[in-house]
């Protein structure tokens, strides 16, 4: 699993000892202002309402497991998901729904109705996003459900469908 | 008023004195890198264009008063509002508008037209969001106006309609 | 070119020497936790798919040149663009597309179909946004392409169309 991360991460570096002990600049650079983030693109082939994600995205201080982002450091996180839909309109309108789940509980959802004219058109594009600001403990899981996952456009726009989290304020 | 906040907030903790004076890790943990944030859900019953919010959301370094978030620490803030609409389409199209106001001035608005086919349908869902990056002084007010507040879906989706701010960079 | 910035920016202030050497609060306030951000509004008159921006927006640690934001400090950036469209519907549906480019490469795009009923209506409003979390090196360029730039509403809503970036985590 690739973990794109900022070089020289200060994690787990002792503040005392070594050549750093008298150098405040050195000490400050190693200070415990932890940052954690993830930015994953949706998996190419989706076959269920709980979305899967590409493990080879950016993961720093966050794990990915079975469709879940798993938090490793407690704190206040900003969570955002954005999906690109491509709908072949049937005879009726279609409700596109994106659900953000924390520990399997739906914490936030976004809905948009497309194909509302009831006409069978060639295609309709729709972009849907949802954000959340929440305090997450260690091992909290973040996941996304989409009932109409078949309309998520993973072929034309492989980079458009993302789930991202970043730590805003830790609890140290 | 409940103020969900991260434990061990460093606010107003002296940097010198006590057992901390010789321990740089301790000192750094108490350093003055202030964080302020809010995350409020819309009130259940809306009766005017200026939206009201539930006071029992997350408030840390920000006050809530009469539909306004009131800033307590100056700095550059990221402000984001997201609303979920459910429209029973009349015979005509409907323009949904979300206005973000700073000190009563409309600083940003988002508009989306729904029911554009002019057909009376059962319902149309629409999600609307707006963000702003702005420098806010102490006592600056942040509020949201929605002309078509009657379409904000507070019953089916009580958690979806939120106003959030967080301090990106303070002026210390 | 205007560069609105937070006062007392810690950039390039030495950590040692002067009256600050013994005062940890002073030292911490000057610590190298660099922040960079930009918040630009779209130019009034657009004449090509690559959007131009008003140079008199917020620029701090980021340059603007020929439609590009140019990164000056490496790190993980949050990039967000939001556009307000106003479409006089023709006889057919219209696909609105927003492309975020990094070094001229399309990294993310958002599409929405409007006027899907195929009826010539007076107008249809649509708001489109796109975000990206990406590691950017020095001199990386960030730009936005919109094929249907003629529909971007710069007259009714002069403040609505923005491109913003802010540094989440630097590489020191």
């Amino acid at each position: 699993q690739r973990t794109d991360s900022i070089p020289n991460s200060p994690d787990n570096i002792p503040l005392r000892g070594g050549n750093c002990s008298e150098d405040l600049l050195c000490i400050l650079k190693r200070a415990p202002f932890k940052k954690s983030w993830a930015y994953l693109q949706v998996a190419k082939h989706l076959n269920k309402t709980k979305l899967s994600w590409n493990k080879d995205g950016i993961l720093h201080g966050v794990r990915y497991q079975d469709g879940n982002l798993v938090i490793q450091f407690p704190g206040l996180y900003f969570i955002i998901c954005q999906l690109q839909f491509l709908v072949q309109c049937p005879n009726n309108s279609v409700d596109l729904k994106l659900e953000l789940l924390i520990n399997k509980h739906i914490k936030k959802q976004a809905l948009v109705t497309v194909c509302e004219s009831g006409m069978q058109t060639k295609h309709v594009y729709q972009n849907l996003s949802q954000f959340l600001l929440d305090y997450l403990q260690v091992n909290t899981t973040v996941s996304v459900n989409v009932d109409t996952f078949q309309y998520i456009d993973t072929s034309t726009f492989p980079l458009e469908n993302v789930l991202s989290v970043f730590l805003y304020s830790n609890s140290d | 008023q409940r103020t969900d906040s991260i434990p061990n907030s460093p606010d107003n903790i002296p940097l010198r004195g006590g057992n901390c004076s010789e321990d740089l890790l301790c000192i750094l943990k108490r350093a003055p890198f202030k964080k302020s944030w809010a995350y409020l859900q819309v009130a259940k019953h809306l009766n005017k264009t200026k939206l009201s919010w539930n006071k029992d959301g997350i408030l840390h370094g920000v006050r809530y008063q009469d539909g306004n978030l009131v800033i307590q620490f100056p700095g550059l803030y990221f402000i984001i509002c997201q609303l979920q609409f459910l429209v029973q389409c009349p015979n005509n199209s409907v323009d949904l508008k979300l206005e973000l106001l700073i000190n009563k001035h409309i600083k940003k608005q988002a508009l989306v037209t729904v029911c554009e086919s002019g057909m009376q349908t059962k319902h149309v869902y629409q999600n609307l969001s707006q963000f702003l990056l702005d420098y806010l002084q102490v006592n600056t007010t942040v509020s949201v106006n929605v002309d078509t507040f009657q379409y904000i879906d507070t019953s089916t989706f009580p958690l979806e309609n939120v106003l959030s701010v967080f301090l990106y960079s303070n002026s210390d | 070119q205007r560069t609105d910035s937070i006062p007392n920016s810690p950039d390039n202030i030495p950590l040692r020497g002067g009256n600050c050497s013994e005062d940890l609060l002073c030292i911490l306030k000057r610590a190298p936790f660099k922040k960079s951000w930009a918040y630009l509004q779209v130019a009034k008159h657009l004449n090509k798919t690559k959007l131009s921006w008003n140079k008199d927006g917020i620029l701090h640690g980021v340059r603007y040149q020929d439609g590009n934001l140019v990164i000056q400090f490496p790190g993980l950036y949050f990039i967000i663009c939001q556009l307000q469209f106003l479409v006089q519907c023709p006889n057919n549906s219209v696909d609105l597309k927003l492309e975020l480019l990094i070094n001229k490469h399309i990294k993310k795009q958002a599409l929405v179909t409007v006027c899907e009923s195929g009826m010539q209506t007076k107008h249809v409003y649509q708001n489109l946004s796109q975000f990206l979390l990406d590691y950017l090196q020095v001199n990386t360029t960030v730009s936005v392409n919109v094929d249907t730039f003629q529909y971007i509403d710069t007259s009714t809503f002069p403040l609505e169309n923005v491109l913003s970036v802010f540094l989440y985590s630097n590489s020191d």
Partner: antibody
Framework: EVQLVESGGGLVQPGRSLRLSCAAS????????MHWVRQAPGKGLEWVSG????????GYADSVKGRFTISRDNAKNSLYLQMNSLRAEDTALYYC?????????????????WGQGTLVTVSS | DIQMTQSPSSLSASVGDRVTITCRAS??????LAWFQQKPGKAPKSLIY???SLQSGVPSRFSGSGSGTDFTLTISSLQPEDFATYYC?????????FGGGTKVEIK
Amino acid sequence: EVQLVESGGGLVQPGRSLRLSCAASGFNFDDYAMHWVRQAPGKGLEWVSGISWRSGNIGYADSVKGRFTISRDNAKNSLYLQMNSLRAEDTALYYCAKDKGIGFNWNYEGFDYWGQGTLVTVSS
Amino acid sequence: DIQMTQSPSSLSASVGDRVTITCRASQGISNHLAWFQQKPGKAPKSLIYAASSLQSGVPSRFSGSGSGTDFTLTISSLQPEDFATYYCQQYVTYPLTFGGGTKVEIK
């Protein structure tokens, strides 16, 4: 009590220079944007120039662009207008006005206080 | 530049009358509009900001409305001290611009 007192006006020949000052008191000067507005005899109001709280955002009317320079000294609670290459049409009463906002990212919020003005007459 | 057009340029009214002055912007300015009152030989006085918000100390008979391009200043019951010239101003973008003014005279 908020007070804005303009000074530096007077009679000047075309092509010459003049520097106007505005002394502010009764509020935190460095927390607000400031502006210059002028009014020619018997005419309406014309905005001349504005400056944000930290001088990062500065704007001018087309009629004075390249000739006038606005500045401020927050330590002295003072606003200035350096007027070069003066013309007869610059003859006016010049007002200093305080903004309710800071001027950062268009945080202009309207003028809430005005000075009494200083008269500038450009004539040969 | 954004042009601000005020109408009428002058009007005559009596004490107790309801007076309405309109201001139109050449393009959208959201609600970034102010109204000022000026009496002969005096500095302008701020009445309204953000199109409809009353400056502190201004009597409640003054009210403002509008958003986008069309705005209105209303004096619900004209008082003797209200006879003056009124200006609108946009401050959404440089250059800030004023309307030409409306002179309210005694009938």
